[in-house]
Amino acid sequence: TVPPMVNVTRSEASEGNITVTCRASSFYPRNIILTWRQDGVSLSHDTQQWGDVLPDGNGTYQTWVATRICRGAEQRFTCYMEHSGNHSTHPVPS
């Protein structure tokens, strides 16, 4: 088992909004849960976009999930990752 490296980034979207992207890379096996939580509960699936789980060329995999949020509400969002029985949560950077 190779645990993922998880990285959260933000980018400007429309006025007053930002897109936050959570990337998991260099993990094996390929089964992974990567999702955004808002206010501690599940963010609805129709407000998230997922990338495919793809090989990254080193025998490991990578994927991502993104969502658009209001600027100023970043604290209320965390990216949740679960892989091979381990889990972690990742805040949006300031």
């Epitope: 849960i33 206010d39 501690g40 509960v41 599940s42 949740y80 029985g85 949560t89």
Partner: antibody, heavy 119, light 107 residues
């Protein structure tokens, strides 16, 4: 460590309002987290009532929405529960708690305060 | 709302026994589940979050598992301090709801 302490009257008359205070020490309620009220009925059923978060946003259980208000006093690091038009069915032990945004579970609770609704 | 159904409502067990408590959600909660222990006259204490993760300070005789709508809490080699009531709680969506509880009593 975050510590929470509930206070308020132990007896309320039917049709009146129930008002409780949660005093938080060890952490500023404006820094982060969702600050919650949960109650436990005499037969031990637990009910999440709602929260006020670090920025003052509230979220209530729809079953209580017409009767509940959660507010705060940031200068005293306190948050409050008001429940109007109470009946004997609102007799319960009321707890305050908080959760972090990595997941809505409750790591620490206050000791609880029993409120009896009776004429 | 998601309803949480716990079973059994109560059980009697002896020190050293293994007990299992189950919790069924009315919909898929995708591991968004916590377990609490409550002793008589005390506040609930967090045992497990994210369905399987033990909270800080929880003894390793406790374990939890499950997925989808079915979850369980197992206590290996029950100790005197383990007697009390246990509750599950989902956090998939609002409103957050709890199971009705399982009371673990001394046989």
């Amino acid at each position: 460590d975050v510590q929470l302490q509930e206070s308020g009257p132990g007896l309320v008359k039917p049709s009146q309002s129930l008002s409780l205070t949660c005093t938080v020490t060890g952490y500023s309620i404006t820094s982060d987290y969702a600050w919650n009220w949960i109650r436990q009925f005499p037969r031990n059923k637990l009910e999440w009532m709602g929260y006020i978060n670090y920025s003052g946003t509230t979220n209530y259980n729809p079953s209580l929405k017409s009767r509940i208000s959660i507010t705060r006093d940031t200068s005293k690091n306190q948050f409050f529960l008001q429940l109007i038009s109470v009946t004997t069915e609102d007799t319960a032990t009321y707890y305050c708690s908080y959760y972090r945004y990595d997941g809505a579970w409750f790591p620490y609770w206050g000791q609880g305060t029993l409120v009896t609704v009776s004429a | 709302d998601i309803q949480m159904t716990q079973s059994p409502a109560s059980l009697s067990a002896s020190v050293g026994e293994t007990v299992t408590i189950t919790c069924r959600a009315s919909g898929n909660i995708h591991n968004y589940l916590a377990w609490y222990q409550q002793k008589q006259g005390k506040s609930p204490q967090l045992l497990v979050y994210n369905a399987i993760m033990l909270a800080d300070g929880v003894p390793s005789r406790f374990s939890a598992s499950g997925s989808g709508t079915q979850y369980s809490l197992k206590i290996n080699s029950l100790q005197p301090e383990d007697f009390g009531s246990y509750y599950c709680q989902h956090f998939w969506s609002f409103p957050l709801t709890f199971g009705a509880g399982t009371k673990v009593e001394i046989k």
